[in-house]
Interface confidence: low
């Protein structure tokens, strides 16, 4: 349904609040270092023009794309070059090269200030002095640092921003109130950031193939009782909503999203029982619901697979007559009867099965060849089983923060060129799958846990992209989307690493170590364990971990102490005289 | 199955252009990425462009990027390669080819069905 103007049809479907909204997320999403300012002069022009377009569709320049008519905003920003050095090349490009161009300088790690947030009554008294203002600001704030952050679902996050400050301004106890709400969207926007992240690296490196595998796993762990046709529909949707939204179009994205949501909640009867309650809320509420929705019970007395796929003697007239459709039914028949499995597992059997199919359906006696595939999928689902029960097992004995430093020594190992803030922040996330996946039954972990690590190691792949400095690491991350945990798992200590020089200054601490929340006091001990191993690579876990008791000891100590600076200046230099000679440094 | 015809290949001068066109028939046009490759005599077969379901990606081997164009009308199943600043090593046979699903690799085994070719000769 092509629209002579296609910035006011989208005006006038999303309406001018979210309109706003989105445009700004677009533009600081690719102009991550331009000041808040700027954006909203920018988008204030870009609403202007569109309420001219919603009058009359005819007027000049309305006929034009989004992307020209964004694209051009973008370049009317006098400090371009300055700011963003070849970034400003994009603009002598034409649509839709430019586009592109704007999108592979997406930073995913800015040098942005971190965001130190204000005291509650600051807070409070900003929100009322100009709500519109301070809720605009959080989300430029979040879109500059999350430039693939899911735009429709930051709509949400910022309507529960705003509900937090309506409701807790008011309390008698606004921090007791508003704190936790804040931590709790501080934490579920990162871990949103990260998943849409995933979406948009499968996309843009692994291509539509691979996402739209990876969305009929999920949809059919999700919606089992749902047939394929239907599941095939909502694929392709989704497909096309997350394309737009990683691909920067931010309108289209929330329309066809907004869309999607309506056709689920009217055709929830052929899809999941489990939709009602989602159904019934408004929109952005709506949305969020159905993708976080648990999945429909399965259906009762559901045939056995090899029917259809091992036994039948049409296996290979059906795949060659339908590739991809064949490997789709097959990748839905599976998902959908093992919600206990990861997605990764199961895009890992259906390329088990398209490979044994590809190399046997050439072969003489196709179904002798093809007869035993199934056999081949159970050391691929007992590889994350073993795992994942080891792991538990070693959290539960560890604890969170223990748990974390043996997976920051066991990386540290792995890849020691990788930079240590990254190693640190990923180590920790990745040791966060224990107290996320590990109380589950049995169940559910291996879903849990393996779809989590691919989240997370994303961050690691996507952060190393910008800076390589590891062929192991470029070689998981860019060989198999569903095989880099494997990758990951199955690498050794790299024993082609020089150890780095021994630098006392990196293990000198200051009494402001005394301040820091606990948080921030375990990311410096784990800085510096990622120090020490990256200079002794060889250390074993009894010495690491006699050095970081020791550190330990020594923090407590000093933060302890009447004067406590020059308690770190005497009691470091022993320290590291200590850990010199307990590590042979 | 879905049938792929190319045409309007020939002979141009170097800096010339040419318009390449693949009708598609027997298949949703609409759900397939479309790609075009082309086989020099005596090379092997290697990618030229493609372009997805509904145009938001495009795709180009870096020896042509600047200079081809790809684009396609879903309401006529018809993808179009528009060739601009041919040189002498554009010489090839260009086929058209459609994929179901792509992992927007270069290899040519990614794509499902294939047309007969059409040949563009650049040459003074």
């Known amino acids: 349904d092509a629209h002579k103007s296609e910035v006011a049809h989208r005006f006038k479907d999303l309406g001018e609040e979210n309109f706003k909204a989105l445009v700004l997320i677009a533009f600081a999403q690719y102009l991550q270092q331009c000041p808040f300012e700027d954006h909203v002069k920018l988008v204030n022009e870009v609403t202007e023009f569109a309420k001219t377009c919603v009058a009359d569709e005819s007027a000049e320049n309305c006929d034009k794309s989004l992307h020209t008519l964004f694209g051009d905003k973008l370049c009317t920003v006098a400090t371009l070059r300055e700011t963003y050095g070849e970034m400003a090349d994009c603009c002598a490009k034409q649509e839709p090269e430019r586009n592109e161009c704007f999108l592979q300088h997406k930073d995913d790690n800015p040098n942005l200030p971190r965001l130190v947030r204000p005291e509650v009554d600051v807070m409070c008294t900003a929100f009322h002095d100009n709500e519109e203002t301070f809720l605009k600001k959080y989300l430029y704030e979040i879109a500059r640092r999350h430039p693939y952050f899911y735009a429709p679902e930051l709509l949400f996050f910022a309507k529960r921003y705003k509900a937090a400050f309506t409701e807790c301004c008011q309390a008698a106890d606004k921090a007791a109130c508003l704190l936790p709400k804040l931590d709790e969207l501080r934490d579920e926007g990162k871990a949103s950031s990260a998943k849409q992240r995933l979406k948009c690296a499968s996309l843009q490196k692994f291509g539509e193939r691979a996402f739209k595998a990876w969305a009929v796993a999920r949809l059919s762990q999700r919606f089992p009782k749902a047939e394929f046709a239907e599941v095939s529909k909502l694929v392709t949707d989704l497909t096309k909503v997350h394309t737009e939204c990683c691909h920067g179009d931010l309108l289209e994205c929330a329309d066809d999203r907004a869309d999607l949501a309506k056709y689920i909640c009217e055709n929830q009867d052929s899809i999941s029982s489990k939709l009602k309650e989602c159904c019934e809320k408004p929109l952005l509420e709506k949305s969020h619901c159905i993708a976080e929705v648990e999945n429909d019970e399965m259906p009762a007395d559901l045939p056995s697979l090899a029917a259809d796929f091992v036994e039948s003697k049409d296996v290979c007239k059906n795949y060659a007559e339908a590739k991809d459709v064949f490997l789709g039914m097959f990748l839905y028949e599976y998902a959908r009867r093992h919600p206990d499995y990861s997605v990764v597992l199961l895009l890992r059997l259906a390329k088990t099965y398209e490979t044994t199919l590809e190399k046997c359906c050439a072969a003489a006696d196709p179904h002798e060849c093809y007869a035993k595939v199934f056999d081949e999928f159970k050391p691929l689902v007992e590889e994350p089983q073993n795992l994942i029960k080891q792991n538990c097992e070693l959290f539960e004995q560890l604890g969170e923060y223990k748990f974390q430093n043996a997976l920051l020594v066991r990386y540290t190992k792995k890849v020691p060129q990788v930079s240590t803030p990254t190693l640190v922040e990923v180590s920790r996330n990745l040791g966060k799958v224990g107290s996320k996946c590990c109380k589950h039954p049995e169940a559910k972990r291996m879903p849990c846990a393996e779809d989590y690590l691919s989240v997370v190691l994303n961050q690691l792949c996507v952060l190393h992209e910008k800076t390589p400095v590891s062929d192991r690491v470029t070689k998981c991350c860019t060989e198999s989307l569903v095989n880099r945990r494997p990758c990951f798992s199955a690498l050794e200590v790299d024993e082609t690493y020089v150890p780095k020089e021994f630098n006392a200054e990196t293990f000198t601490f200051h009494a402001d170590i005394c301040t820091l929340s606990e948080k921030e006091r375990q990311i410096k001990k784990q800085t510096a364990l990622v120090e020490l191993v990256k200079h002794k690579p060889k250390a074993t876990k009894e010495q690491l971990k006699a050095v970081m008791d020791d550190f330990a000891a020594f923090v407590e100590k000093c933060c302890k102490a009447d004067d406590k600076e020059t308690c770190f200046a005497e009691e470091g230099k022993k320290l590291v005289a200590a850990s010199q000679a307990a590590l042979g440094l | 199955d879905v049938q792929l015809v190319e045409s309007g290949g020939g002979v141009v001068q170097p800096g010339g252009s040419l318009r390449l066109s693949c009708a598609a028939s027997g298949g949703t046009f609409s759900t397939y990425v479309m790609g075009w490759f082309r086989q020099a005599p005596g090379k092997e077969r290697e990618f030229v462009s493609a372009i997805s379901q509904n145009s938001i990606h495009t795709y180009y081997a870096d020896s042509v990027k600047g200079r081809f164009t790809i684009s396609r009308d879903n309401s006529k199943n018809t993808v179009y390669l528009q060739l601009n600043s041919l040189r002498p090593e554009d010489t090839a046979l260009y086929y058209c080819?459609?994929?179901?699903?792509?992992?927007?690799?270069?290899?040519?085994?990614?794509?499902?069905?294939w047309g007969q070719g059409t040949l563009v000769t650049v040459s003074s």
């Open positions: 080819a459609a994929s179901r699903f792509t992992s927007w690799y270069t290899a040519d085994y990614e794509y499902d069905y």
